[in-house]
Interface confidence: low
């Protein structure tokens, strides 16, 4: 169950989808990927206060225990809830191939 | 693909399963759970350096971009890869009920 989407830290500060532009060089892919030359990497960034976007019961527990024992138990973390597929044109020994990666671009985010 | 399991930070410092003992009061469950009175909560705690236990391609990208832009892109985070079910005996209006929760106790951890 996705819990509250209201961010008590102010607009845009809590866990949400962001886009980071990265070149093949940034990603360390220049030697095996031909295209795209640049990737708009969607990723999950932001704080996970209280029950904000709690992914499941485990996330709720983590929030409670982090409040009690902040030095021992970390706060929940903002991670992908689902992904978008992306096609890469890869270099191969014989030429090029198209490969779809299902776990490359974050689609939606939650706290866990 | 699960990447390297060698922790460069020293034994036990990287992402792994930990057990945290918690009472019903700690968890805020005292008003709706009868048993168990105490839960051994298994959770994922620890650092995610380089490609340590990278869950997928997204985690690998995150590592690369964190290295380049540490102020913008956070390091991957240690989260459950799977869960163990747990049965709680809950209070109900008519007495008690047994309820299995599939997403309460972490079983295995990875970095994402």
């Amino acid at each position: 169950a996705r819990n509250g989407d209201h961010c008590p830290l102010g607009p845009g500060r809590c866990c949400r989808l962001h886009t980071v532009r990265a070149s093949l060089e940034d990603l360390g892919w220049a030697d095996w990927v031909l295209s795209p030359r640049e990737v708009q990497v969607t990723m999950c960034i932001g704080a996970c206060p209280s029950q904000f976007r709690a992914a499941n019961m485990h996330a709720q527990i983590k929030t409670s225990l982090h409040r009690l024992k902040p030095d021992t138990v970390p706060a929940p973390c903002c991670v992908p809830a689902s992904y978008n597929p992306m096609v890469l044109i890869q270099k191969t020994d014989t030429g090029v191939s198209l490969q779809t990666y299902d776990d490359l671009l974050a689609k939606d985010c939650h706290c866990i | 693909a699960r990447n390297g399991d060698h922790c460069p930070l020293g034994p036990g410092r990287c992402c792994r399963l930990h057990t945290v003992r918690a009472s019903l009061e700690d968890l805020g469950w005292a008003d709706w759970v009868l048993s168990p009175r105490e839960v051994q909560v298994t959770m994922c705690i620890g650092a995610c350096p380089s490609q340590f236990r990278a869950a997928n391609m997204h985690a690998q990208i995150k590592t690369s971009l964190h290295r380049l832009k540490p102020d913008t892109v956070p390091a991957p985070c240690c989260v459950p890869a799977s869960y163990n079910p747990m049965v709680l005996i809950q209070k109900t209006d008519t007495g008690v009920s047994l309820q299995t929760y599939d997403d309460l106790l972490a079983k295995d951890c990875h970095c994402i």
Epitope: L17, T19, R21, P36, Q40, T42, V87, K107 | -
Partner: antibody, heavy 119, light 107 residues
Framework: EVQLVQSGAEVKKPGASVKVSCKAS????????LNWVRQATGQGLEWIGD????????IYNQKFKGRATLTVNKSISTAYMELSSLRSEDTAVYYC????????????WGQGTLVTVSS | DIQMTQSPSSLSASVGDRVTITCKAS??????LAWYQQKPGKAPKLLIS???SLETGIPSRFSGSGSGTDYTFTISSLQPEDIATYYC?????????FGGGTKVEIK
Amino acid sequence: EVQLVQSGAEVKKPGASVKVSCKASGYTLTDYNLNWVRQATGQGLEWIGDLNPYNQGIIYNQKFKGRATLTVNKSISTAYMELSSLRSEDTAVYYCAREGRGGAWFDSWGQGTLVTVSS
Amino acid sequence: DIQMTQSPSSLSASVGDRVTITCKASEDIYHRLAWYQQKPGKAPKLLISGATSLETGIPSRFSGSGSGTDYTFTISSLQPEDIATYYCQQYWSPPFTFGGGTKVEIK
């Protein structure tokens, strides 16, 4: 050539639902997200939500969450947007739009479907 | 939600004039900005993505610039066929939001 062809104009009564279709051709449907945007007469553009046809992942604009439902039938390369509990202020042209690769700019648009809500 | 404030809401210029439209985001959108042209009765058409990248087939008189929260769209030499309404749109964070539009007319 990428084409998004939408269903025809609809007239609905307040409280009813409408389902608009968007048939994609000229590319592989599952390779790109499909977004829905509306525009009331003489007004600006308002994003409703997007659908990942590959895994049916959806992000809704909170304003429409609970009233809008985005679905896809991959076998016929068609996406749908259903809006329920219609009110007069939902009168608008509804567009489907293909999302760019890796970023939510919209590089191809349907021709639009006029939905009129009137008693 | 990120608010996009576009100005002016309308403008009138002569053929050959340089036309500038601005778009201000309520927070940093890190170049995640697109510009569209919409003619009456038609769907919007993508002109620019990534704040500055001109789409294939779009005339070079159209350009975009800016960073952070402030972005600019320019038509270097206005042509009769450029009469339309122009919209900016942020895609940094959902819900993706559009500016209110700028209607461009010929004097």
